[in-house]
């Protein structure tokens, strides 16, 4: 898996809803692939991490003053929805096809 | 200034274009306020860091498995433009009124 020594990339992160206490309201799925953005944002920032101008500037300032300014951070830049079956306020199972922002689609340096 | 022990927030970062080698093409300004997003994304994630569902999930998984999964990261979530005067290939000064993504407007946990 990608550590701090490798460049920013999307890695697997299986999330079990019981582990995070969400099994009290999410009926299904029991777990899902959330993914995680891992790795460093090293100079020079590659196109595949879609850096903003600010991220490029911060990377250059970090090169010059590494103790004063941090590197840009590897984070989700695009998220995908999942479908979930959950209990509503009255305990009725309800299907939400598009439960937004639950899974990483793309990672980048920000 | 905000360190890793404080919560995610926008802090000052004055960038001098000479320091990053951009003075070769940016005539003015000589420096600008880029800001930096600093601090941790701690549980529970506050509304002011506008967490995505994925960031909330990752924070909860980190609580459960701190060595396996990292915390969400404090990054710019909204950027502002600045106006820059730059030299073109012929050395002619040209103005970019709306040079996007150069300064942090808002920070959040992603």
């Amino acid at each position: 898996s990608a550590g701090a020594g490798s460049h920013c990339q999307k890695t697997s992160l299986r999330v079990n809803f019981e582990d995070i206490g969400w099994d009290s309201w999410i009926i299904a799925p029991k777990e899902y692939e959330a993914y995680e953005c891992k790795g460093g944002c090293f100079f020079p920032l590659a196109d595949d991490v879609t850096p903003t101008k600010h991220a490029i500037v911060q990377t250059l300032v970090h090169l010059k003053f590494p103790t004063k300014v941090g590197k840009a951070c590897c984070v989700p830049t695009k998220l995908s929805p999942i479908s979930v079956l959950y209990k509503d306020d009255m305990g009725v199972p309800t299907l939400k096809y598009h439960y937004e922002g639950m899974s990483v689609a793309e990672c980048g340096c920000r | 200034s905000a360190g890793a022990g404080s919560h995610c927030q926008k802090t000052s970062l004055r960038v001098n274009f000479e320091d990053i080698g951009w003075d070769s093409w940016i005539i003015a300004p000589k420096e600008y306020e880029a800001y930096e997003c600093k601090g941790g994304c701690f549980f529970p994630l506050a509304d002011d860091v506008t967490p995505t569902k994925h960031a909330i999930v990752q924070t909860l998984v980190h609580l459960k498995f701190p060595t396996k999964v990292g915390k969400a990261c404090c990054v710019p979530t909204k950027l502002s433009p600045i106006s820059v005067l730059y030299k073109d290939d012929m050395g002619v000064p040209t103005l970019k009124y709306h040079y996007e993504g150069m300064s942090v407007a808002e920070c959040g946990c992603r």
Epitope: - | P29, V92, T94, K96, Y97
Partner: antibody
């Protein structure tokens, strides 16, 4: 020497159309973000819109009063900037300048009147 | 009503120092990006000052400063050829382009 020369102005009836041109020389036109700025008779300056360089997407942005009626385009092979003005109103009467922000043309007068 | 407020007129005698102010009254405008244009009678506007950059051909009698939400243009050793209109301009983030002040007509007396 940088030169911007506008042309195409004239008298047009309300609801009519006009296309302005701006011939550029003395700088790398293809890399420049180009704007149109107008000045109504006896009034101040008003930004009309801007086009980025093609290498930066060639995106256009417009001021609210002209959005949907005016279109900015560029032909880098001819070093020329254009402003297509449709559905003209009397309040569009002005001298229209093309500019890099640092350099300005001499302007061309557009009069919208019946 | 312009979001950059200038006095409609200013005057002075030859050799005097004149200051023209430009006040920001809109949060979409950052005073940092404010700059100045000169328009002499019957001519196109000309960039006078952008941050600390003065285009070649512009006299060093012109200088710009910024404080709080105001920018100022100072002209020392006033000359009859300085007569004309002076416009401040800023970057309107919402509009994604420049916005101009209403202009100040400078008259050189005597």
């Amino acid at each position: 020497e940088v030169q911007l020369v506008e042309s195409g102005g004239g008298l047009v009836k309300p609801g009519g159309s006009l296309r302005l041109s701006c011939a550029a020389s003395g700088f790398t036109f293809s890399n420049a973000w180009m704007s149109w700025v107008r000045q109504a008779p006896g009034k101040g300056l008003e930004w009309v819109g801007r086009i980025k360089s093609k290498t930066e997407g060639g995106d256009t942005d417009y001021a609210a009063p002209v959005k949907g009626r005016f279109t900015i385009s560029r032909d880098d092979s001819k070093n020329t900037l254009y402003l297509q003005m449709n559905s003209l109103k009397t309040e569009d009467t002005a001298v229209y300048y093309c500019t890099t922000g640092t350099y300005w043309g001499q302007g061309t007068l557009v009069t919208v009147s019946s | 009503q312009s979001v950059l407020t200038q006095p409609p007129s200013a005057s002075g005698t030859p050799g005097q120092r004149v200051t023209i102010s430009c006040s920001v009254t809109n949060t979409d405008i950052d005073i940092f990006n404010v700059h100045w244009y000169q328009q002499l009678p019957g001519t196109a506007p000309k960039l006078l000052f952008f941050h600390d950059y003065r285009p070649s051909g512009v006299s060093d009698r012109f200088s710009g400063s910024k404080s709080g939400t105001s920018a100022s243009l100072a002209i020392v050793g006033l000359q009859s050829e300085d007569e004309g209109y002076y416009y401040c301009a800023g970057l309107d983030e919402a509009m994604r382009g420049p916005v101009f002040g209403g202009g100040t007509k400078l008259t050189v007396l005597g």
